[in-house]
């Protein structure tokens, strides 16, 4: 664990440590005002107490000011993501000041030492902000700190130490090791800014979680459950570079938070929406696609300020690359069984047909099991905007296409050897779009034929806007 009393050490240590000889020593924290999108352009270095560089470099006191804070580094140089983020901010907010906090000398250390340096770097940023506040027209309200990994906690310290309250902190996959379960003042927390939003892309329950698992903001967004990011599997990584390694997978998933944020800046017309949910499993079941009472929000730069009394965990699915947006649908399927079929695990697929496009064949992920004579809820998502849904094809996968399915079939047969006619009845499917919040009901195309069995399919056509059917008396329960 880090030394108690952190980077500054105890007072005796501070007094007894020999000071480095102060001859042309580069400061260990530098503030680089990026005046151009071009990563080759060096920009200007701001210096505490020196107003001239602010004037020379055209620092706009009334504009938004972004501070980009990198994390731990193995290379000791800026990584590519940082230049992309600088460029995206300049594109989106043309008049804004974009400041890169360069703490590379303190971050290019053993991880534990870099952690111990976060406090002092946060303090340096706070002192810079305190100095800027002395200038006319500069307002902390316009300050947005964006910290990646260890940099997210640096941003937390900066927000903690500054005199006043910064407008916003965005934590991009805040670092996990040595911060998980840490005291509220020793990590990024909702108290550090007026609005703290967080993207978690590399959290693991087992093994080392590079990103912090616990919520640390006003809203904490867990894309794809916050763990396995599409396009970051070993196969994907191996396919896209000559020597793919586990390290590259880690980097891909951890850094995905940055790219999701960049996406929100440059693809303003394709915002990704996240939905409040108590946990990832409930989200995977399709239970949490409501936008009532601030239960959904855009992710990244476009997130709406929400300062709930309690932290809000939010989830969404994404594509494997930019633009990351997908279209979420909740599907409620009431499954009737006229025969006692025992435990049954059908493998269902759906194809959605819309006015704009048709989806690919999408698996219905069964999180627990199919409940018979009950309504089952599923989450499906498409990469393209299908427009208004017209019809749905539901397929029960037939002949086993995997050892797992073969085992399921065998187990099902062993439990019910005298029940060859495995059959379920589905009369209608209710669908809710996460993005539009529209509810639709789809009825079996042939009301006389609502049964489905392995290798067979059923077609459903839109028969109603909304979920209430004419002959239904009980109101549908509004899901949380």
């Amino acid at each position: 664990s880090p030394t108690p009393f952190g980077p500054e050490g105890q007072l005796e240590d501070e007094l007894h440590k020999p000071k480095a000889i102060q001859t042309e020593v580069k400061p260990s924290v530098r503030f680089n005002l990026r005046t151009s999108k071009d990563p080759e352009h060096e920009g200007c270095y701001l210096s505490l107490g020196h107003s001239q560089p602010l004037e020379d470099c055209g620092f706009n006191m009334t504009a938004k000011t972004f501070f980009i804070i990198h994390g731990w580094t193995m290379s000791g140089i800026f990584e590519n993501w940082l230049h992309k983020l600088v460029s995206a901010l300049h594109t989106r907010e043309k008049d804004a000041n974009v400041v890169v906090v360069d703490w590379l000398p303190l971050a290019h250390q053993l991880y534990t030492d870099a952690v111990n340096n976060t406090r002092v770097v946060g303090h340096s940023i706070a002192r810079m902000l305190d100095w800027l506040q002395e200038k006319d027209d500069f307002s902390l309200e316009n300050v947005h700190l964006i910290g990646y990994s260890l940099g997210a906690h640096v941003a937390g310290y900066a927000g903690n130490f500054v005199k006043g309250t910064v407008g916003r902190i965005t934590g991009l996959d805040p670092a996990g090791p040595m911060f998980e379960g840490a005291d509220i003042h020793k990590r990024l927390s909702p108290d550090d800014a007026d609005f703290v939003d967080v993207l978690h892309t590399y959290t693991r329950s087992f093994g080392l979680s590079i990103g912090i698992q616990m919520p640390v903001g006003h809203i904490d967004i867990y894309p794809n459950g916050g763990d396995f990011q599409p396009g970051c599997g070993l196969n994907d990584v191996l396919g896209s570079m000559a020597y793919g390694t586990i390290t590259e997978v880690v980097k891909c998933e951890h850094e995905r938070a940055v790219h999701l944020f960049v996406d929100s800046l440059v693809n303003q017309d394709k915002p990704s929406f996240a939905f409040q949910c108590t946990d990832s499993n409930r989200f995977k079941k399709g239970i949490c696609l409501s936008c009532r009472k601030n239960r959904c929000n855009s992710i990244g730069y476009n997130a709406k300020k929400m300062r709930n009394k309690r932290n809000s965990k939010m989830y969404l699915k994404t594509r494997a690359g930019m633009p990351f947006r997908v279209y979420h649908y909740q599907m409620k399927i009431h499954v009737f069984s006229y025969k006692n079929m025992g435990e049954i695990e059908p493998t269902f697929y759906v194809t959605l047909y819309g006015t704009n496009a048709d989806s690919q064949t999408l698996p219905l992920e069964i999180v627990e099991r199919i409940e018979q004579n009950a309504t089952n809820t599923f989450l499906v998502y498409t990469e393209e905007d299908l427009g208004d849904l017209l019809k749905i094809q539901l397929t029960w996968e037939g002949a086993s296409q995997s050892w797992y399915n073969l085992w399921k079939e065998l187990r099902s047969y062993l439990s019910q050897p005298h029940n060859p006619g495995r059959e379920l009845n589905i009369r209608r499917i209710r669908v809710k779009s996460g993005e539009t919040q529209r509810k639709l009901t789809f009825c079996a195309e042939d009301p006389e034929n609502t049964s489905i069995s392995p290798g067979r399919e059923l077609w459903f056509r839109k028969c109603r806007d909304g979920w209430r059917m004419k002959n239904e008396t009980s109101p549908t329960v509004e899901l949380p």
Epitope: P4, K186, P190
Partner: antibody, heavy 116, light 107 residues
Framework: QVQLQQSGAELMKPGASVKISCKAT????????IAWVKQRPGHGLEWIGE????????KYNKKFKGKATFTADTSSNTAYMQLSSLTSEDSAVYYC?????????WGQGTSVTVSS | DIVMTQSHKFMSTSVGDRVSITCKAS??????VAWYQQKPGQSPKLLIY???YRFTGVPDRFTGSGAGTEFTFTINSVQAEDLAVYYC?????????FGGGTKLEIK
């Protein structure tokens, strides 16, 4: 090493105010939160609130808002808590504690007795 | 506010025994829990932070575990000097809240 030295015991009349001090040595005073904790005889610990001396930021337990006021003097490395409109309910030992990993180090406590 | 509940106000044990004290949070506090020891007539001392990490200088017979809403503090081989009141505290959010305390008595 880190030390927090609190002011001595106080005997106060109901309705009066009292100001307790907590002098810190052994660390950088301005950048660590100092919390104040109440303990009534035979009772548990109750968090009153805390102050970050360098920025004078404060956090209060809503139960103690209007009762307790925190200040800090960075030139003397001393934190203060003032308790106003004292009643017998305020009779307790008050601790200051400095926060890093948790309440890492505590003062020895200041006993406040309110009696007419 | 998050309520921290220590169900046992008193626990009795013998020297050399292993004893466990439990603490329950009213909502998820993840692993943001600390344990303190207060000996008679003394100030509290930090023993465990972040649910399972021992603070500097704390003997390894003291351990902490748990996550979410249920936490346990264990003394593996109780010594006579461990007679004290033990408090849990959540440090996940403000206001910080303490459990009511568990007084450990040595038989």
């Amino acid at each position: 090493q880190v030390q927090l030295q609190q002011s001595g015991a106080e005997l106060m009349k109901p309705g009066a105010s009292v100001k307790i001090s907590c002098k810190a040595t052994g660390y950088t005073f301005s950048t660590y939160w100092i919390a104040w904790v109440k303990q009534r005889p035979g009772h548990g610990l109750e968090w009153i609130g805390e102050i970050l001396p360098g920025s004078a930021k404060t956090k209060y337990n809503k139960k103690f808002k209007g009762k307790a006021t925190f200040t800090a003097d960075t030139s003397s490395n001393t934190a203060y808590m003032q308790l106003s409109s004292l009643t017998s309910e305020d009779s307790a030992v008050y601790y200051c504690a400095v926060y890093d990993y948790g309440a890492d180090y505590w003062g020895q406590g200041t006993s406040v007795t309110v009696s007419s | 506010d998050i309520v921290m509940t220590q169900s046992h106000k008193f626990m009795s044990t013998s020297v050399g025994d292993r004893v466990s004290i439990t603490c329950k949070a009213s909502q998820d506090v993840y692993t943001a829990v600390a344990w303190y020891q207060q000996k008679p007539g003394q100030s509290p001392k930090l023993l465990i932070y972040s649910a399972s990490y021992r603070f500097t200088g704390v003997p390894d017979r003291f351990t902490g575990s748990g996550a979410g809403t249920e936490f346990t503090f264990t003394i593996n081989s109780v010594q006579a000097e461990d007679l004290a009141v033990y408090y849990c505290q959540q440090h996940y959010s403000i206001p910080r809240t303490f459990g009511g305390g568990t007084k450990l008595e040595i038989k």
